[in-house]
Amino acid sequence: TQNKALPENVKYGIVLDAGSSHTSLYIYKWPAEKENDTGVVHQVEECRVKGPGISKFVQKVNEIGIYLTDCMERAREVIPRSQHQETPVYLGATAGMRLLRMESEELADRVLDVVERSLSNYPFDFQGARIITGQEEGAYGWITINYLLGKFSQKTRWFSIVPYETNNQETFGALDLGGASTQVTFVPQNQTIESPDNALQFRLYGKDYNVYTHSFLCYGKDQALWQKLAKDIQVASNEILRDPCFHPGYKKVVNVSDLYKTPCTKRFEMTLPFQQFEIQGIGNYQQCHQSILELFNTSYCPYSQCAFNGIFLPPLQGDFGAFSAFYFVMKFLNLTSEKVSQEKVTEMMKKFCAQPWEEIKTSYAGVKEKYLSEYCFSGTYILSLLLQGYHFTADSWEHIHFIGKIQGSDAGWTLGYMLNLTNMIPAEQPLSTPLSHSTYV
């Protein structure tokens, strides 16, 4: 008789990452009977919501429902109907909403209320919309990449799943760059974490981890650019800002009201004799790098060692996965290869920034000009942040692995968030079941 395939006994979960620049919906799937195994959850779908981040809907909250519709309908299609009612949906908002909450708690609540109202209409089991802390964002990113790399598994493998995976159980550090914040998270080597705010203790699969994490609000790539512009316009003699972080020949008009809209530029705010100014690109990597360094206050450190702005940072240890915008920007610049040294990256950035804007537009005709114009700044910012901010060196650069996906799942905080909220990472190592993976029945 022919063997009939048994119906798949699987579960699904949905996480919406409400970032500062956009929202993405991720659908995860796992075998129901292996919930506590490490590495069994994988991403089956990513849907990028069309439009800006949810914090931008503050004056048009009635549009949030329509904004979320396409991706929520996509989830309805991907997940079998029989599973809808038991599929949890989580929405986590990050630094864009943290900034909005700093300006007005009432406005942030109003946005989240409308998000909750919209997501409650779907047949899934909505579990809430909340602004996650920077510490959570760092911690869940660290959990995600180490879960996907198999670092929590006690069973050492004879094969390597991903090119940069070593077969030891040393965890990877996590470097996450968003639009409004950036996170650094890793296990320091026998080092006391001198600042309690930066210390996390986990027990995962029977092992204790003492983890350092910090989230730098306002140091995501978009907010860092606003900061740099606000700093530089202070010393401009007129409404022309000659900017080394943009390509020669590039021109853009900026409203001063937009510049000072974000809490991130408050420290540079001043009364200017004009309402608008024009950025004129001059495309000089070295000058751009110098300008960016002025955003990092390294003159004050109340600890044995700091990153910048008086924030404790232990000595770097081990390998790091750099994801989100670290990856997207470096991928665009073709600088994600393990073989590219830091010196080579710097050399290529110098050449890229010096290229005329008209030439760049022709070479990358399919890329939106808004994004295309900012790659020189973003690439330079990444180098500045990693080298001067976090103290990577030319030698330790090879320990940074620019990661987009691991085994088909995006690197980022969302998977770790769901694993935690669905209690799928046990504190203790699960006992092996009598019928292990290799048993024939």
């Epitope: 009612q85 209320d113 109202r117 409650s120 209409n121 779907y122 909505f126």
Partner: nanobody, 113 residues
């Protein structure tokens, strides 16, 4: 299976009061926005009132100051206290997950002298 069961409807004279209840099961009630909607004879559905998981409330203008929505997350129950009822409040009242999601069978409210 999502189940919403309304109760508490009935006949009342203008100016009278009723308290509607909705027992919810099959989903995580405490995390969802919940609403009351109504359907008057020969009319479409009208959203009446909503409450967030955190207890923030909203109402259609025509019932503001007369109706009060509340929830008991421990009991998985949604309520609608209706005071100063008017003939135009006559309708079948439904409790819904979200403002247009799953809803119950409804409970009839009739206001007349």
């Amino acid at each position: 299976q999502v189940k919403l069961q309304e109760s508490g409807g009935g006949w009342v004279q203008p100016g009278g009061s009723l308290r509607l209840s909705c027992a919810a099961s099959g989903f995580t009630f405490r995390t969802h926005f919940m609403s009351w909607v109504r359907q008057a004879p020969g009319q479409g559905l009208e959203w009446v009132s909503g409450i967030t998981s955190g207890g923030r409330t909203s109402y259609v203008d025509s019932v503001k100051g007369r109706f009060t929505i509340s929830r008991d997350n421990a009991a998985n129950t949604l309520y609608l206290q209706m005071n100063s009822l008017k003939p135009e409040d006559t309708a079948v009242y439904f409790c819904t997950k979200g403002d247009s999601g799953a809803r119950g069978q409804g409970t009839q409210v009739t206001v007349s002298s």
